[in-house]
Interface confidence: medium
């Protein structure tokens, strides 16, 4: 499981880096596939 602690500086626990995305726009409503702080968060 990938547990996301977005509210603590985007710390990621037990994160499996399943994919990366070239598009790193800031559209908050589409976090899947975006990267924050260099790690995939969803």
């Amino acid at each position: 499981d990938a547990e996301f602690r977005h509210d603590s500086g985007y710390e990621v626990h037990h994160q499996k880096l399943v994919f990366f995305a070239e598009d790193v726009g800031s559209n908050k409503g589409a976090i899947i596939g975006l990267m924050v702080g260099g790690v995939v968060i969803a």
């Epitope: 996301f4 977005h6 598009d23 559209n27 409503g29 589409a30 899947i32 596939g33 975006l34």
Partner: antibody, heavy 121, light 108 residues
Framework: EVQLQQSGPELVKPGASVKISCKTS????????MHWVKQIHGKSLEWIGG????????NNNQKFEGKATLTVDKSSSTAYMELRSLTSEDSAVYYC??????????????WGQGTSVTVSS | EIVLTQSPTTMAASPGEKITITCSGS???????LHWYQQKPGFSPKLLIY???NLASGVPTRFSGSGSGTSYSLTIGTMEAEDVATYYC?????????FGSGTKLEIK
């Protein structure tokens, strides 16, 4: 007004594939993750996966790997889910559901009306 | 995956009665990532409460939510006939996102 309009009911044979559509309006399609959720009659909800319409990147429930493929067509603001190698266990209502704008928390603030898929020979 | 267990599975309440539905996680959930949905018979689910305690747009104030860790609850302050539905909790903290088993609320 945000609207998610899904395609109509499907009756398909075992082993076949089906592609369900979810046409959106009332918001900027590329700014909200689109999720797909399965509901077998009278039972709970099961998250299939989500897709970022901006770049087509998906994240799926491993249970549905090889079963469900999520895609989008940005030009028509439509999300699609293809289900393949259908069996009776795939008979269900399938919903598309948009993440709320603050998708960091992944609540789903707008749902399609559902598409019934029946697998029968 | 995080399994969400709701209780009770089914309940019947009289108009005006206070209702509490609980959602228990198999692992801890950050409160920002726990949401509640209402599904009336024959309709799609509707977002009711997001991030544990925030009412979605248009939701009556008789609904409220609370909780932390592995234990969350949905409360209806005074049951009304229009509240007959099945209620689901959902977590967005861990992939795969999961929903609770559901609580069917009926009226006496």
């Amino acid at each position: 007004e945000v609207q998610l309009q899904q395609s109509g009911p499907e009756l398909v044979k075992p082993g076949a594939s089906v592609k369900i559509s979810c046409k959106t309006s009332g918001y900027t399609f590329t700014e909200n993750t689109m999720h797909w959720v399965k509901q077998i009659h009278g039972k709970s909800l099961e998250w299939i996966g989500g897709i970022n319409p901006n770049n087509g990147v998906t994240n799926n429930n491993q249970k549905f790997e090889g079963k469900a493929t999520l895609t989008v067509d940005k030009s028509s603001s439509t999300a699609y889910m293809e289900l393949r190698s259908l069996t009776s266990e795939d008979s269900a209502v399938y919903y598309c559901a948009r993440s709320d704008y603050d998708a960091l928390y992944y609540s789903m603030d707008c749902w399609g009306q559902g598409t019934s898929v029946t697998v029968s020979s | 995956e995080i399994v969400l267990t709701q209780s009770p599975t089914t309940m019947a309440a009289s108009p005006g009665e206070k209702i509490t539905i609980t959602c228990s996680g198999s692992s801890s959930i950050i409160s920002n990532y726990l949401h509640w949905y209402q599904q009336k018979p024959g309709f799609s689910p509707k977002l009711l409460i997001y991030r544990t305690s925030n009412l979605a747009s248009g939701v009556p104030t008789r609904f409220s939510g609370s909780g932390s860790g592995t234990s969350y609850s949905l409360t209806i302050g005074t049951m009304e006939a229009e509240d007959v539905a099945t209620y689901y909790c959902q977590q967005g903290s861990s992939i795969p996102f999961t929903f609770g088993s559901g609580t069917k609320l009926e009226i006496k």
